[in-house]
């Protein structure tokens, strides 16, 4: 056979035996002559270098460029390719010689006691066990152990080739420790050398450092870094570390394989770097590399080394947090420190504990912020080693979108007597206070009879064309008073009033309040009637268990048949046209009430009395009168609110305080309840009486002690009482300093 490229000037070397394959018996002599057109060389099996003693290469006697290769007494191991080639070219002629040695049918490689076969556990990969034959047509099988298994050529993926060896899918022998080829000749078995099976993997899935980040230590502490490499099976791993002071004398490295669950397709290796007594020069990047030979992966982490334990607040720590009612508030404690500090939160000096509404940790989280969450929050960081403390105050301001206090009525509504002057009020509570309250109006019939709009609980008046009250053409003459500020139920509220000079036209009025976080609105139905008039005796909202009378007064010459009704619970009207006062047209929803009739010179007065008013008595009361001439019914509606009885409560705590002699003390005690409670003060459980030094103001809400003396020290109690009970708060006042002896000073005394 010829190998190489044909050349114009050179013919291939010519062999004396013109065959591709030559088969000879052992112990005979092999002699091949090669002739060519320039210097020739021979290559033969098992020794490519030409130093074999048994092989003789001689120049031919009969010509130039001719060499004869001779091997006397050939053996099975001489089987193989014999190549004659021109020096420094690829031009060659090759003959494959089988030396049939039935006592040694396999060619042994030079000086090999055993061979090594490298395989990967891959279903698609085949491996060749190089048990070459000295006979071309041997019946060869492969034996693997342990356990013992025999593989026979199947004409497909398992085969034996005398020039190549035994080919088999690698996964079939990956379990084995060793394999060898076996040939049967005349019932005799012959074995090749043993081949050790080495299963190789190489893939590294990942390299993970633990701790992975944020490693901080102080000088003298021990650093322990674990580096874990996860690999496929049958992988060996080299680890290496790179770090700031790699020549560290206190360094310790331990590498080991980790046990993985059986059946796992993964192997784990661990390298642990330990540095005892870390120093500042050890600060920096630590990198662990894991390598299988074909794949390297690495991972890094930064180690920060502090001179000593410390704690401090980070620059991003807020001092003011603003939120709107209902929002989730997060106030993170931003700190620098080693080791991480213990974190404690306080509100107005009281420790905060986590519950379902608040989480006090690295981040103070208030799930749904409310007004009462407003205040100063102190976060105290404590270094667990040095016990050094740092504190920071965060002010939380909770904003409230405008809320309009008066109950928003849907239907029906109070009626107003024709021609009277009326005042409409919107009491707005908002934080910050509203930057404006605007009033708008619209004629009742424009709004009520718009069939294209559906009515909902949230929007009972489907009015869109609201007009500013400055433009009162076609409506009632209006004047908007300057906003007033009032303390109502302990809250600062803004009161906006709209004065209707003369009630001539039925209309709807809307007040709209806006602040930085939202808006609120209230729609007031202003229904003007020329019919009867309702008044309340006494003229204030009753509290439960009080008595109240509703008076319906009508001109006797105009009206007759005065009757009191109470409006029963009713669903919202379906039709827009029924708004806003459908009462007179639909008497089915009215319950007739018992009442007493009185008369004076001009009027009939129908009085409906409620003794011991209860919350069930709240609602809309209708007085119906009939026009004597036209028989047309006129009805007037009045909403009655019954206030709930509420036991006294005191808002805000009295706080213990220390004052120096001669200074003044001023404290407040705000109480609420219905009926309104009476406030009394006690010192050391004895009633406190006003005198020149003790001043009680605002219904005893505010207590001032002027020019305090040592005798003023003691336990002060504020007590708020009503028929429903009492509430009290206490505080201890400490008076410091020496009493000055002077006759000029006016001393107050206590009773």
């Amino acid at each position: 056979a010829s190998v190489g490229l044909p050349s114009v000037s050179l013919d291939l070397p010519r062999l004396s035996i013109q065959k591709d394959i030559l088969t000879i018996k052992a112990n005979t002599t092999l002699q091949i002559t090669c002739r060519g057109q320039r210097d020739l060389d021979w290559l033969w099996p098992n020794n490519q270098s030409g130093s074999e003693q048994r092989v003789e290469v001689t120049e031919c006697s009969d010509g130039l460029f001719c060499k004869t290769l001779t091997i006397p007494k050939v053996i099975g191991n001489d089987t193989g390719a014999y190549k004659c080639f021109y020096r420094e070219t690829d031009l060659a002629s090759v003959i494959y010689v089988y030396v049939q040695d039935y006592r040694s049918p396999f060619i042994a490689s030079v000086s090999d006691q055993h061979g090594v076969v490298y395989i990967t556990e891959n279903k698609n990969k085949t491996v060749v066990i190089p048990c070459l034959g000295s006979i071309s047509n041997l019946n060869v099988s492969l034996c693997a152990r342990y356990p013992e298994k025999r593989f026979v050529p199947d004409g497909n993926r398992i085969s034996w080739d005398s020039k190549k060896g035994f080919t088999i899918p690698s996964y079939m022998i990956s379990y084995a420790g060793m394999v060898f080829c076996e040939a049967k000749i005349n019932d005799e078995s012959y074995q090749s050398i043993m081949y050790i099976v080495v299963v190789v993997g190489y893939r590294i899935y990942d390299v993970v450092l633990s701790p992975s980040h944020g490693i901080e230590l102080s000088v003298g502490e021990k650093l322990v870094l674990n580096c874990t490499a996860r690999t496929e099976l049958n992988v060996g791993i080299d680890f290496n570390w790179e770090y700031p002071s790699s020549k560290h004398q206190h360094k310790k490295l331990v590498n080991r394989d980790l046990k993985t669950q059986s059946g796992s397709e993964m192997k784990k290796f661990l390298s642990t770097l330990t540095i005892d007594g870390i120093t500042r020069s050890d600060q920096g990047l630590y990198t662990c590399a894991a390598s299988s030979g074909l794949m390297t992966k690495k991972n890094s982490t930064f180690v920060r080394v502090h001179e000593k334990p410390f704690v401090a607040f980070g620059s991003g720590m807020e001092s003011l947090v603003e939120a709107t009612v209902g929002e989730r508030v997060r106030i993170p404690a931003k700190y620098l420190g080693y080791p991480p500090p213990e974190i404690k939160w306080y509100k107005n000096g009281i420790p905060l504990e986590s519950n379902h509404t608040i989480k006090a940790g690295h981040v103070l989280t208030i799930m749904e912020v409310s007004e009462r969450d407003t205040g100063n929050y102190t976060v105290i960081l404590t270094n667990p080693i040095s016990k050094e403390k740092q504190s920071h105050v965060v002010s939380l301001v909770v904003y409230v979108p405008p809320q309009i206090g008066e109950k928003s009525l849907i239907s029906p509504v109070d009626s107003y007597q024709y021609g009277t002057t009326q005042t409409l009020t919107c009491t707005v509570y908002a934080i910050p206070p509203p930057h404006h309250i605007h009033w708008y109006w619209q004629l009742e019939e424009e709004c009520a009879n718009e069939p294209s709009h559906a009515v909902s609980v949230t929007n009972p008046y489907p009015c869109e064309e609201w007009r500013s009250v400055e433009d009162f053409q076609g409506g009632n003459k209006i004047e908007v008073n300057k906003n007033q500020f009032a303390l109502i139920e302990g809250k600062n509220k803004t009161v906006s009033t709209l004065v209707i000079q003369a009630a001539n036209v039925s209309a709807l009025y809307k007040c709209e309040a806006v602040n930085k976080v939202g808006r609120g609105e209230r729609v007031i139905s202003f229904h003007v009637t020329r019919g009867p008039e309702i008044t309340l005796q006494p003229d204030m909202q009753p509290t439960e268990q009080e008595s109240v009378s509703l008076w319906c007064t009508a001109d006797r010459s105009t009206f007759e048949n005065l009757t009191w009704y109470k409006l029963g619970p009713q669903p919202l009207p379906i039709h827009v046209g029924e708004l806003p006062t459908p009462v007179c047209k639909n008497l089915d929803t009215l319950w007739k009430l018992n009442a007493t009739m009185f008369s004076n010179s001009t009027n009939d007065i129908l009085i409906m009395e409620l003794k011991n008013a209860s919350l069930q008595d709240q609602g809309d009361y209708v007085c119906l009168a009939q026009d004597r001439k036209t028989k047309k019914r006129h009805c007037v509606v009045r909403q009655l609110t019954v206030l709930e009885r509420v036991a006294p409560t005191i808002t805000g705590n009295l706080e213990n305080q220390t004052t120096s002699i001669g200074e003044s003390i001023e404290v407040s005690c705000t109480a609420s309840g219905n009926p309104p409670p009476q406030i009394m003060w006690f010192k050391d459980n004895e009633t406190l009486v006003e005198d020149s030094g003790i001043v009680l103001k605002d219904g005893n809400r505010n207590l001032t002690i002027r020019r305090v003396r040592k005798e003023d020290e003691g336990l002060y109690t504020c007590q708020a009482c009503s028929v429903l009970g009492c509430a009290k708060v206490e505080a201890f006042f400490i008076i410091e300093g020496a009493q000055e002896k002077t006759n000029l000073e006016h001393h107050h005394h206590h009773h």
């Epitope: 990967t120 891959n122 698609n124 990969k125 190789v200 190489y202 893939r203 899935y205 060996g236 791993i237 080299d238 680890f239 290496n240 790179e242 990198t287 590399a289 894991a290 390598s291 299988s292 030979g293 074909l294 794949m295 390297t296 992966k297 690495k298």
Partner: antibody
């Protein structure tokens, strides 16, 4: 700047031996796997051998197994390829390459080996 | 061993135009970790190879975004948009899914 400089190539007779060296600089040599890749004239690139960072694990192409030995000296930042029983088909430009995640991200300029009698 | 076939062998281009080089593997290069282990190299004339793309589509650092890699388990494409004079050389693909790692036969990109 990462640099890999190969040396030791030359002309050698079939059956002869040679050792190639690759001097590394500009990176921490001991943290990277290293490989030899060769390119015979007009042929495709062929991976030859690879070695792990500590030198414990080596891999070879079937064509050079048993004849070539890859090794490294991390103290000297040098990679080696000891080549024995050289054949004509080993003639090629030999590149050393740095490996990370299995990728050869930096290569040397190569050294030429010619095997011829 | 996995055989990598590259086409075309030669690719004459005009600067500014876009070209694609194909690479086909005798076996899927999608490994069980979900990654496709195919790399692209450029060997400029007289220089050593330079890594362009790894894991089929990730550009190596410093490689312009004109180079992009795509493909499936066995068929892969290197696209060069707006070819520049400095892009000439031989482009090789390489598989890393199975040892021994093998290279494609190369595609020579030359300016017309």
């Amino acid at each position: 700047e990462v640099q890999l400089v190969e040396s030791g190539g030359g002309l050698v007779k079939p059956g002869g031996s040679l050792r190639l060296s690759c001097a590394a600089s500009g990176f921490t040599f001991s943290m990277y796997g290293m490989s030899w890749v060769r390119q015979a004239p007009g042929k495709r690139l062929e991976w030859v051998a690879s070695i792990s960072i500590g030198g414990s694990y080596t891999y070879y192409a079937d064509s050079v197994k048993g004849r070539f030995t890859i090794s490294r000296d991390n103290a000297k930042n040098t990679l080696y390829l000891q080549m024995n029983s050289l054949r004509a088909e080993d003639t090629a430009v030999y590149y050393c390459a740095r490996e990370m995640d299995g990728n050869y991200d930096y290569w040397g300029h190569g050294t030429t080996l010619t095997v011829s009698s | 061993d996995i055989v990598i076939t590259q086409t075309p062998l030669s690719l004459p281009v005009t600067p500014g135009e876009s070209v694609s080089i194909s690479c086909r593997s005798s076996k899927s290069l999608l490994y069980k970790d979900g990654k496709t282990y195919l790399n692209w190299f450029l060997q400029r004339p007289g220089q050593s190879p330079q890594l362009l793309i790894y894991l089929m589509s990730t550009r190596a650092s410093g490689v312009p975004d004109r180079f992009s890699g795509s493909g499936s388990g066995t068929d892969f494409t290197l696209k060069i948009s707006r070819v520049e004079a400095e892009d000439v050389g031989v482009y090789y693909c390489q598989q890393l899914v199975e040892y021994p790692f093998t290279f494609g036969s190369g595609t020579k990109l030359e300016i017309k």
